[in-house]
Interface confidence: medium
C-alpha cells in the first residue's frame, strides 16, 4: 500500500509548487522502510556495492561536474543547477569556461579553472581547508572538499558568492540519491538536508540512509554485521 501526501512546498526557483510524497506503507503496520534500514535490516546496498546505485551516483557526479551557479537577477538567491535549468532572462548562469575562470592559485599563474563556479564556495575565499601549496583544489568541482571556514569578508565581489544560497544537497530515498533542494522540500520528502555542503559530491547519501556505524570508506558499503543484527 502507498500513502500519498501533497503539499505546497518552496522549490528551487523560489516559487511554491504542489509536491507529492509517496511513502510505501509497511504491510504489517510498523516502521517505514527507511526506519527499518536504520535499525539494521538486511538491506544489501548497505552491505556491499550495488551496481545500480553506483551508476546513479556516477551519473549525478557527471551532471554536477557540468553545473554552475544560477543567480537570480532580482537578488532573491542562487542555486547550483544545469544551464538548461537556469532562466536566461531572469537569472545569470555563472560558469567558468575558456578564460573566464580564476587562476588555479597565486603560485600557479598559467592555469585557469574551467570547472565551477559553485554557489557559496570558491577556492579563493575558503580558509579551511585552504586551496594552496600542495593542497590546491583540483579543477573538478566534484573533488572539492567542504569548506568549513570562509574568509572573513561580507562581500567578495563574486556573483556566486555574494548571493543568498537557496539550495543544498538533500539525500532522498533508500537508493541514496542526492538533489540540490531547498530545506523545505527536503524535509517534506523526508530527506536529509546537508547544511554544511554545497555539492552532492561532498555528501555520501548511502552512508546516511544506512545509519548504524559509518562506512570506513564513505564510498564503499561495509555493514556485513547486518546479517547478524536482523
Amino acid at each position: 500500500a502507498q500513502h500519498v501526501t501533497t503539499q505546497l512546498v518552496l522549490r528551487n526557483k523560489g516559487v511554491y509548487e504542489s509536491v507529492k510524497y509517496i511513502q510505501q506503507e509497511n504491510f504489517w503496520i510498523g516502521p517505514s522502510s527507511i526506519d527499518l534500514i536504520h535499525l539494521g535490516a538486511k538491506f544489501s546496498p548497505c552491505i556491499r556495492k550495488d551496481q545500480q546505485i553506483e551508476q546513479l551516483v556516477l551519473r549525478e557526479r557527471d551532471l554536477e561536474r557540468d553545473s554552475g551557479c544560477c543567480v537570480q537577477n532580482d537578488h532573491s538567491g542562487c542555486i547550483q543547477t544545469q544551464r538548461k535549468d537556469c532562466s536566461e532572462t531572469l537569472a545569470t548562469f555563472v560558469k567558468w569556461q575558456d578564460d573566464t575562470g580564476p587562476p588555479m592559485d597565486k603560485s600557479d599563474l598559467g592555469q585557469k579553472r574551467t570547472s565551477g563556479a559553485v554557489c557559496h564556495q570558491d577556492p579563493r575565499t575558503c580558509e579551511e581547508p585552504a586551496s594552496s601549496g600542495a593542497h590546491i583544489w583540483p579543477d573538478d568541482i566534484t573533488k572539492w572538499p567542504i569548506c568549513t571556514e570562509q574568509a572573513k569578508s561580507n562581500r567578495t565581489g563574486f556573483l556566486h558568492m555574494d548571493c543568498q544560497i537557496k539550495g543544498r544537497p538533500c539525500c532522498i530515498s533508500t537508493k541514496g540519491s542526492c538533489e540540490i533542494t531547498t530545506r523545505e522540500y527536503c524535509e517534506f520528502m523526508h530527506g536529509y538536508f546537508h547544511e554544511e555542503a554545497t555539492l552532492c559530491s561532498q555528501v555520501h547519501c548511502l552512508d546516511k540512509v544506512c545509519g548504524l556505524l559509518p562506512f570506513l570508506n564513505p564510498e564503499v558499503p561495509d555493514q556485513f554485521y547486518r546479517l547478524w543484527l536482523s
Partner: antibody
C-alpha cells in the same frame, strides 16, 4: 581613482640597505584579492620584477635577488615596503610599485603603476 | 626562468602604417601581457590575457598568439604610439619581461 606613489632615499652608498615605501589610495590591501608588486628599471634598460605581496600576506620574490629582498605592508596606512639589503651600484634604477590586477577578478596584470622613484647607489 | 625575446629591438613606422612586433618565450606560456612606456613615464598596461584590451586602450591595438609565440599589432600607426613596448609573462615565477621593442615615428 587608484594612485600609487613611491618614495625612497634618492642616494645611498654600497653595502647599505635600501628602504622604499609605496603609498597608495583608491583601494585597500585588506580587500580580498588585492596585491602590490615592485618592479625596477635601470636607466635606459628594461623592466625587472622584484617582488609582490598579496592581501593575505602571501609574498613572492625574484629568486635572483631573494636573499636581499624583504617585502611587507601596513594595511591600515595603505603602504607597502621593500627593503634591499647590501646594495651595489647595479641596484641603481627607477623603482616602481604597481597594483597587481585583482586576484579576485580572474586576471593578473600590473594594472596601475606609480610614477617611480629614482635610486642611485654611489660611493 | 622563462626568457622573453622581443623582436625587432627597434623599428619605425609612418602614420597609418600597420605595425607588428613579436615576443618569443623560451618555454610555453598560457597568456601574454603587453605594456607601453613613453620616455619619462611609467609603463601602462595595454593588453592582458594575450588578446584583451585594457581599459581606455584604443581599438587599433590587438594581441594574439599562443604557446611560445605572441604578437602585438597596431592596425594604423599614430604619432602618439611612438614608445617602447614590453611583453610580460605571469605563467611562472620569476615573472619576466622582454627587453622591449622601441617603436619610432618615421
Amino acid at each position: 581613482q587608484v594612485t600609487l606613489k613611491e618614495s625612497g632615499p634618492g642616494i645611498l652608498q654600497p653595502s647599505q640597505t635600501l628602504s622604499l615605501t609605496c603609498s597608495f589610495s583608491g583601494f585597500s590591501l585588506s580587500t580580498f584579492g588585492m596585491g602590490v608588486g615592485w618592479i625596477r628599471q635601470p636607466s635606459g634598460k628594461g623592466l625587472e620584477w622584484l617582488a609582490h605581496i598579496w592581501w593575505d600576506d602571501d609574498k613572492y620574490y625574484n629568486p635572483a635577488l631573494q636573499s636581499r629582498l624583504t617585502v611587507s605592508k601596513d594595511t591600515a596606512k595603505n603602504q607597502v615596503f621593500l627593503k634591499i639589503a647590501n646594495v651595489d651600484t647595479a641596484d641603481t634604477a627607477i623603482y616602481y610599485c604597481a597594483r597587481v590586477g585583482n586576484y579576485g577578478s580572474n586576471y593578473w596584470y600590473f594594472a596601475v603603476w606609480g610614477t617611480g622613484t629614482t635610486v642611485t647607489v654611489s660611493s | 626562468q622563462i626568457v622573453l625575446t622581443q623582436s625587432p629591438a627597434i623599428m619605425s613606422a609612418s602614420p597609418g602604417e600597420k605595425v607588428t612586433m613579436t615576443c618569443s618565450a623560451s618555454s610555453s606560456v598560457s597568456y601574454m601581457y603587453w605594456y607601453q612606456q613613453k620616455p619619462g613615464s611609467s609603463p601602462r598596461l595595454l593588453i592582458y590575457d594575450t588578446s584583451n584590451l585594457a581599459s581606455g586602450v584604443p581599438v587599433r591595438f590587438s594581441g594574439s598568439g599562443s604557446g611560445t609565440s605572441y604578437s602585438l599589432t597596431i592596425s594604423r600607426m599614430e604619432a602618439e604610439d611612438a614608445a617602447t613596448y614590453y611583453c610580460q609573462q605571469w605563467n611562472s615565477y620569476p615573472l619576466t619581461f622582454g627587453a622591449g621593442t622601441k617603436l619610432e615615428l618615421k
